[in-house]
Interface confidence: low
């Protein structure tokens, strides 16, 4: 088949006001092409136009959302053009307000286990899209469940591997405007844990401190971890520090917690800069307890 291949860079999901490059590649090496839009609003800058190699489209508006195909120049064809390419659907985000994205039971998922990603909104979206950062393939399309308070979808993801870990966002859309999406949800980092041996966690001056006293938690390992992550049980988010090689041959990071007022169970994880969403087993939990009133200085 002499069909060319149409692709979108950096991806098919484009924020309103941003740009997208449509690239048409011919197996026969012809670099001139025409573009057509099959649905949605017309885009006048495509009409009767011949492009070379690629077309930088934007700043995009909801009018740019829709299905595109290209035809490459083909001197041996009766029309002078190839057959139409594969379709590329450009989705424009920012048209509706953003939904929320949550992970159950949480965003840190043991290797091999399953996590449920829940996207919900007070807008009645019939469709949701789930998109992983850095992936150019089409996002996952999911059917929303409508209810009085809005809409939601649950997506079960697993068994967990480093290939599934990453930064996720979800979008909502309504049936009559399928390619016009909401603003993206806040990003959700899904991390696979348990890929490497656990680091150790200790406290200076100790795990029991006076209220208002400074405490530093040290995470260390003989593994060549670049980064350590410190998390507190029942709290979202984590602290992140670069590891430093110590004289004794361990890689360590010191987390100064400052004047503490509340105790809690802490754990730390190690990871490598090249695989930011793949972490070690957690350290053994370190309970930090706070006693008495803050010391008068």
């Amino acid at each position: 088949q002499d069909k060319p291949f149409l692709s979108a860079w950096p991806g098919t999901v484009v924020s309103e006001g941003q740009h997208v490059t449509l690239q048409c590649r011919s197996r026969l090496g012809f670099n001139e092409f025409s573009l057509s839009k099959e649905d949605g609003m017309p885009v006048p800058e495509l009409y009767n136009r011949i492009f070379r190699n690629s077309f930088l489209m934007g700043p995009v508006t909801p009018a740019h959302a829709g299905t595109y195909r290209c035809c490459s120049s083909h001197p041996h064809s009766p029309t002078g053009w190839s057959a139409p390419s594969n379709p590329v659907v450009i989705m424009v985000t920012g048209v509706h307000r953003k939904p929320s994205l949550l992970a159950h039971p949480g965003p840190l998922v043991k290797s091999g286990e399953t996590v449920i990603l829940q996207c919900w909104s007070d807008v009645r979206f019939e469709r949701f899209l789930l998109h992983r950062e850095g992936i150019t393939e089409d996002p996952l399309r999911l059917v929303g469940q409508l209810h009085d308070a809005g809409s939601q979808v649950n997506y079960s993801m697993g068994p967990m591997t480093p290939a599934l870990a990453g930064t996720y966002r979800c979008f909502g859309s309504v049936t009559h405007l399928p390619y016009e999406l909401s603003a993206p949800s806040d990003p959700l980092d899904i991390v696979v844990v348990g890929l490497y041996g656990k680091p150790s966690l200790s406290a200076q001056p100790g795990p029991t401190v006076q209220a208002g006293e400074n405490v530093t938690l040290s995470c260390s390992s003989r593994s060549l971890f670049d980064i350590y992550h410190l998390s507190r049980e029942a709290e979202a988010g984590e602290l992140r520090l670069t590891a430093v090689l110590r004289v004794n041959g361990t890689f360590q990071a010191n987390f100064p917690l400052g004047p503490v007022t509340h105790g809690g169970n802490y754990r730390c994880f190690g990871s490598f800069r090249a695989l930011p969403h793949a972490w070690s087993d957690p350290s053994d939990p370190l309970p930090v307890s706070v006693t008495g009133n803050s010391r008068n200085l």
């Epitope: 860079w9 941003q18 740009h19 490059t21 690239q23 006048p44 800058e45 009409y47 009767n48 136009r49 011949i50 070379r52 190699n53 690629s54 930088l56 934007g58």
Partner: antibody, heavy 119, light 107 residues
Framework: ELKLEESGGGLVQPGGSMKLSCVAS????????MNWVRQSPEKGLEWIAE??????????HYAESVKGRFTISRDDSKSSVYLQMNNLRAEDTGIFYC??????????WGQGTLVTVSA | DIQMTQTTSSLSASLGDRVTISCRAS??????LNWYQQKPDGTVKLLIY???ILQLGVPPRFSGSGSGTDYSLTISNLEQEDIATYFC?????????FGAGTKVELK
Amino acid sequence: ELKLEESGGGLVQPGGSMKLSCVASGFTFSNYWMNWVRQSPEKGLEWIAEIRLKSNNYATHYAESVKGRFTISRDDSKSSVYLQMNNLRAEDTGIFYCTPFYGSSFPYWGQGTLVTVSA
Amino acid sequence: DIQMTQTTSSLSASLGDRVTISCRASQDISNYLNWYQQKPDGTVKLLIYYTSILQLGVPPRFSGSGSGTDYSLTISNLEQEDIATYFCQQGNTLPFTFGAGTKVELK
């Protein structure tokens, strides 16, 4: 605020070399094909060279009058585009502007830098 | 290469006048015609692209029209700040080419 700032112009002898630089700010530089356009009293405005995006493998195109003598390059990390000019001729004299290309036009222009080729 | 011809190199007009500048391409450029304004200090600004679409921030007294090979730029009500040289440019085919310019002066 959107800005394009050309530099590197000046007086050069025929056969000499010169490198022009242009620093951009206020727009997503890496999303735009970048161009150099020259203006002279004899030839008016004249498109000189174009460099495309990383996704286009930084493909370049040149006007016939400068092919083989001029080289356009870019550094997206510095939002900069360059024009290396070798074997300069008197007819290369003019004001050189760097400008991004969008759709079919050059939407933003800098103040230009003057290149004078003279003995 | 596509040649762009602006037959009028300069014209004189009074403030408030309607001014039309024409541009002809040596072959059909499918409406990929742009107009630029260059002020006496050398500043270049895109006014109109794709024959008739006003660039953001350009006042509506400027308009463009044409098709095929013949295009024009109209200033409906000339103002002092419009005193400049106007260039047409085709964006249909490499190499992109410009007209020689039309200088608008005050009578």
